[in-house]
Amino acid sequence: MAVTACQGLGFVVSLIGIAGIIAATCMDQWSTQDLYNNPVTAVFNYQGLWRSCVRESSGFTECRGYFTLLGLPAMLQAVRALMIVGIVLGAIGLLVSIFALKCIRIGSMEDSAKANMTLTSGIMFIVSGLCAIAGVSVFANMLVTNFWMSTANMYTGMGGMVQTVQTRYTFGAALFVGWVAGGLTLIGGVMMCIACRGLAPEETNYKAVSYHASGHSVAYKPGGFKASTGFGSNTKNKKIYDGGARTEDEVQSYPSKHDYV
């Protein structure tokens, strides 16, 4: 029951996390520029991985895609790639984990198969979460190291004077959504991996074997009290094959290779 709960909770947490990663990737507010008051209207600029937007005090918003930009830095492309890889891995992980859920029966799928699928999806969620966290962190680092403009940069060009309007960039909401979502996906993945251990069928450390010499009526059974007193699998005191030696689980089944040891 605890395993099923852990697996189910891991799935739900990862699902929320991946939804958050998708949301963060699509959001425009990765970086925001301080609001500045133009004599005409107050303008608020913000930008995401795919486009830049302007919102006026009137409520009017205009967004433009980066496809018109002449050169996008490799770091931005890397962040895009990390987020997309995170989404793809997360989506595959979700698909795998649906079939791995203990509460869902698909044909005659064994617990060992479900355990393997749970582990696979767990690892995928962990990698997905790490990709998202890495992507968001790289972007945040870009803002902190490269794009903080503390002074207004002025110069005179051919067309007259030019000066920067905004003075600095700040973290946008998408960064926080991305960090939280990545963390949730990571936690969900860890929970799936923990659930996998509980799903895997445990193997016994030893197999009790019955030995007896041919022609003798008493069989020597290693394995302690249970074995010697007949409390093992041979509880109905069925005759043990003469000259044979086999594991307890095979006592009531067909002869095995151990019969001829």
Partner: nanobody, 123 residues
Amino acid sequence: EVQLVESGGGLVQPGGSLRLSCAASGSIFSINVMGWYRQAPGKQRELVAGISTGGTTRYADSVKGRFTISRDNAKNTLYLQMNSLRAEDTAVYYCNADLATATSWPVRYLEVWGQGTLVTVSS
């Protein structure tokens, strides 16, 4: 390089009309607010009229009802239709724009000024 080029200035009689144009050229990603400013001899530069991307306009009290600002976002061009001109409208008219260049990321908005066009209202 991004630049603003004004045109349409000249000598006009009081009560006459003029239409100023301002074309933004260069690698432009987007333009936020565009406006016209003027500076009369011995006076400070003042806002005449401004227009945002969304169409929000603002006029100086002295030109309300006489001047009309408009812009063509597709052509990155700003216009100022000046009617019922007076002698006190004589000044150098400057075009101003808050724009982002298409040469860098993240998108940085710059306040760009034109070199100005002279408008003289005299009989």
